[in-house]
Amino acid sequence: NKILVKQSPMLVAYDNAVNLSCKYSYNLFSREFRASLHKGLDSAVEVCVVYGNYSQQLQVYSKTGFNCDGKLGNESVTFYLQNLYVNQTDIYFCKIEVMYPPPYLDNEKSNGTIIHVKGKHLCPSPLFPGPSKP
């Protein structure tokens, strides 16, 4: 049994920011889960992670230097990405793993969302280089 994920085929980030909504064929209420957003055809870069827990606030983080936030709906997680660079235009895939209660469930690979970053050409500062390769 796999969870199905729906994403917009394409989004344009005009001000270096975008909301990407991942809609699941599964109700996340009272579940413990790990939702993540991955960049590239091979999903090589984990852009943002949202840990959902029945009793605690959402934990949202990026280990790859992206500025991200997350918002939870009953059957969706929305990733809010800011300070995107033009060279981060790419395809982005939503992923979900529901861990508790068992059984473990994850998703069929979605079609992804092409995020086209059209914003101002942000230059990475020397102290904080861009988080991913062009």
Partner: antibody, heavy 120, light 111 residues
């Protein structure tokens, strides 16, 4: 035949770190359907879950240890690792790795355990 | 966290006795009709061994004298006729929520 073999235990100084290994055979750590957890047992005490890793590489930790623990794996060696930092006397325990299936998360196979003693 | 309380903490019994151990959870561990409560046996110096999973399913290779029952918050492990090799400590465990937790154990000793 499924087998789990822990290694790396021994005497560690307070404040130090430990890195334990769990070599798996008879199944692949990266195959969907099974995961592995670390569980410990202080001398004469009960069992305490440390954390789990899934076939995807995703991890879950016991909040009481989360700030000090990392579970990782090397798929090429089919081996699981436990890193525990800032060790204290209360971390003295036998450390077990145990496999679970995704249906119920019951631990169906266990290693023999490795003893870690934290003492100066 | 879900607390699991086993009773009794220890018991003395003779070979052939019927032994019952209970495990009470601080909240329900049921989900869609399944109970995420498991039982293990541990002998001194050895790793625990899975006996019963999902409250009442006998793990492969475990003798049929072991049985489990219960749902929600109250669970029971029964040994219908105690054998010499059954003297050990028994633990319940829940896998409904993180952190996964174990009962404090019940030691079954020879009378």
């Amino acid at each position: 035949e499924v087998q789990l073999v822990e290694s790396g235990g021994g005497l560690v100084q307070p404040g130090g770190s430990l890195r334990l290994s769990c070599a798996a055979s008879g199944f692949s750590l990266s195959t969907s359907g099974v995961g592995v957890s670390w569980i410990r047992q202080a001398p004469g005490k009960g069992l305490e879950w440390i954390g789990s890793i899934y076939h995807s590489g995703s991890t879950y930790y016991n909040p009481s240890l989360k700030s000090r623990v990392t579970i990782s794996r090397d798929n090429s060696k089919n081996t699981l690792y436990l890193q525990l930092n800032s060790l204290r006397a209360e971390d003295t325990a036998v450390y077990y790795c145990a496999r679970y299936e995704y249906g119920y998360y019951a631990f169906d196979y266990w290693g023999q355990g490795t003893l870690v003693t934290v003492s100066s | 966290d879900i607390q699991l309380t086993q009773s009794p903490s220890s018991l003395s019994a003779s070979v052939g006795d019927r032994v019952t151990i209970t495990c009470r959870a601080s909240q329900s561990v049921d989900f869609y009709g399944k109970s995420f409560l498991h039982w293990y046996q541990q002998k001194p110096g050895k790793a625990p061994k899975l006996l019963i999973y999902a409250a009442s399913s006998l793990q492969s290779g475990v003798p049929s004298r072991f049985s489990g029952s219960g749902s929600g918050t109250d669970f029971t492990l029964t040994i219908s006729s105690l054998q010499p090799e059954d003297f050990a400590t028994y633990y319940c465990q829940q896998s409904y929520r993180t952190p996964l937790t174990f009962g404090q154990g019940t030691k079954v000793e020879i009378k």
